[in-house]
């Protein structure tokens, strides 16, 4: 079954078109923008989601200090090239023949160049640091309760096994969620940490990608956890290659 049988929709991706034209009249859903068939029992890849988004109408601290190679997605939205499996192609180019290399979450990891730019392989993002600031509350959340609820959220909403949630740090009002997933750890069927982080980011912004499921309602011991801002850092298995010009 590739989608909900009864009304033929995709619970995990509302940016799809679904129809009962799969094998044996089964419901099959295809991502907007690319037309790629998606598995509605799990998260859709970030690449296909970005493509669909671009095709849609425009409407002494315990906290971790990201290391020097951490990437932040400063380039914003672009219309990506995805491979047949829905992964980002290592080289991305725009309509004016400006090209750059990206990592597995689609974030630029080199200076921009021209069509002669080579990106030999898609470099895996194996460590993601999600940095959140929550709205003021009467008192700080209990750290272990917060930790447990966030781990359960990533497991039950984003289908990410807790073994990939490396740590949850908390220093009111800052929460940091560390996701780690090496190539060797990721088995067939495992959700990619990049996809889970993207779904979470969209949820936090009130732009849920889920169909028919309510928006994110995160509570810790009954107390709502409302996020004011999010910053996501990406660390790749191979450090990025930027010229010194960018670093100054």
């Amino acid at each position: 079954h590739t989608a909900a049988q009864d009304n033929c929709t995709c619970p995990t991706n509302k940016m799809t078109v679904c129809s009962p034209d799969g094998p044996g009249g089964r419901c099959q859903c295809r991502a907007l923008g690319s037309g790629v068939a998606v598995d509605c029992s799990t998260l859709t890849s970030k690449c296909l989601l970005l493509k669909a988004r671009m095709s849609a109408p425009k409407n002494a601290r315990t906290l971790v200090r990201p290391n020097e190679h951490a990437l932040v997605d400063n380039d914003g939205l672009y219309d990506p090239d995805c491979d047949p499996e829905g992964r980002f192609k290592a080289r991305q180019c725009n309509q004016t023949s400006v090209c750059w290399c990206v990592n597995s979450v689609g974030v630029r990891r080199t200076d921009k160049g021209d069509l002669s730019l080579r990106c030999d392989e898609l470099v895996r993002t194996h460590h993601i640091l999600i940095d959140l600031r929550h709205r003021p509350t009467a008192s700080a959340f209990n750290h272990s309760d917060l930790d447990a609820e966030l781990r359960r959220l990533f497991r039950e909403r984003y289908r990410l096994h807790p073994k990939f949630v490396a740590a949850v740090h908390y220093e009111q009002p800052t929460i940091q969620i560390e996701l780690r997933q090496n190539t060797s750890q990721k088995a067939a069927g495992d959700v990619d940490i990049g996809d889970a982080a993207y779904y979470f980011e969209r949820d936090v912004k009130g732009e849920s990608l889920f169909q028919g499921r309510g928006g994110l309602d995160l509570r810790v011991r009954g107390e709502p956890l409302q996020v004011e801002r999010t910053l996501i850092y990406y660390l790749d298995e191979i450090p990025p290659k930027f010229s010194m010009k960018r670093l100054t």
């Epitope: 359960r152 984003y158 959700v191």
Partner: antibody, heavy 118, light 109 residues
């Protein structure tokens, strides 16, 4: 790969008891362990769960406060039970998830019997 | 997320067919498992994700369903199928009393 429970006993009402689940042949850190019990002639009842990675614990509403799950070594998980009553008489099973994000239990121990009686 | 399983007991002859129903109080998005338990033994996972057969389980066992309604059908009943069957929602462990259905005893005549 296997799981084995131990520590089941005949105890008095009001007593406490700790059960142990020992894992063999696999890395516990890649899984979650759930405890399930079954009273004689009755159905399965979920007690609680521990995400080994991170150590977070979760309990059925009725089990909160009286039951506590913890990882005690690289191969063992315990279930501590307090203020036991006759209603807690059951076979207690530990089970492992299948390594996916769902709670499918594809490996179970044989169970250990706890009898609460005066 | 209460799981209501029916019937509590069913009796069918060898070669017959049995259908067990399981209803969740809320949508569990096909995250449902079926287990078989024989006396003195722990439960054994038969079906996961509502319809996927665990390795080694005969194709006579068939799971179906979505949303809140699920079924387990056992066809061509054999004596070895005599057991108690349980459904389990595998979607959440938050704020629940039990993730298992009440069980169905299958008697093979």
């Amino acid at each position: 790969q296997s799981l084995e429970e131990s520590g089941g006993d005949l105890v008095q009402p009001g007593a406490s008891l700790t059960l142990t689940c020992k894992a063999s042949g696999f890395d516990l850190n890649n899984y979650s362990i759930l405890w399930v019990r079954q009273a004689p002639g009755k159905g399965l009842e979920w007690i609680g769960c521990i995400y080994i990675s991170g150590g977070s614990t979760y309990y059925a509403n009725w089990a909160k406060g009286r039951f506590a799950i913890s990882k005690t070594s690289s191969t063992t998980v315990t279930l501590q039970m307090t203020s036991l009553t006759a209603a807690d008489t059951a076979t207690y099973f530990c089970a492992r998830d299948d390594g996916t994000a769902s709670y499918y239990l594809n490996l179970w121990g044989p169970g250990t019997l706890v009898t609460v009686s005066s | 997320y209460d799981m209501t399983q029916t019937p509590a007991s069913v009796s069918e002859p060898v070669g017959g067919t049995v259908t067990i129903k399981c209803q969740a109080s809320e949508d569990i998005y096909k995250l449902l498992a079926w287990y078989q338990q024989k006396p003195g033994q722990p439960p054994k996972l038969l079906i996961y994700a509502a319809s996927d057969l665990e390795s080694g389980v005969p194709s006579r066992f068939k799971g179906r369903g979505s949303g809140t309604d699920y079924t387990l059908t056992i066809s061509d009943l054999e004596c070895a199928d005599a057991a108690t069957y349980y459904c389990q929602q595998a979607y959440t462990i938050g704020n629940i009393d039990n993730s298992f259905g009440g069980g169905t005893e299958v008697v093979v005549k």
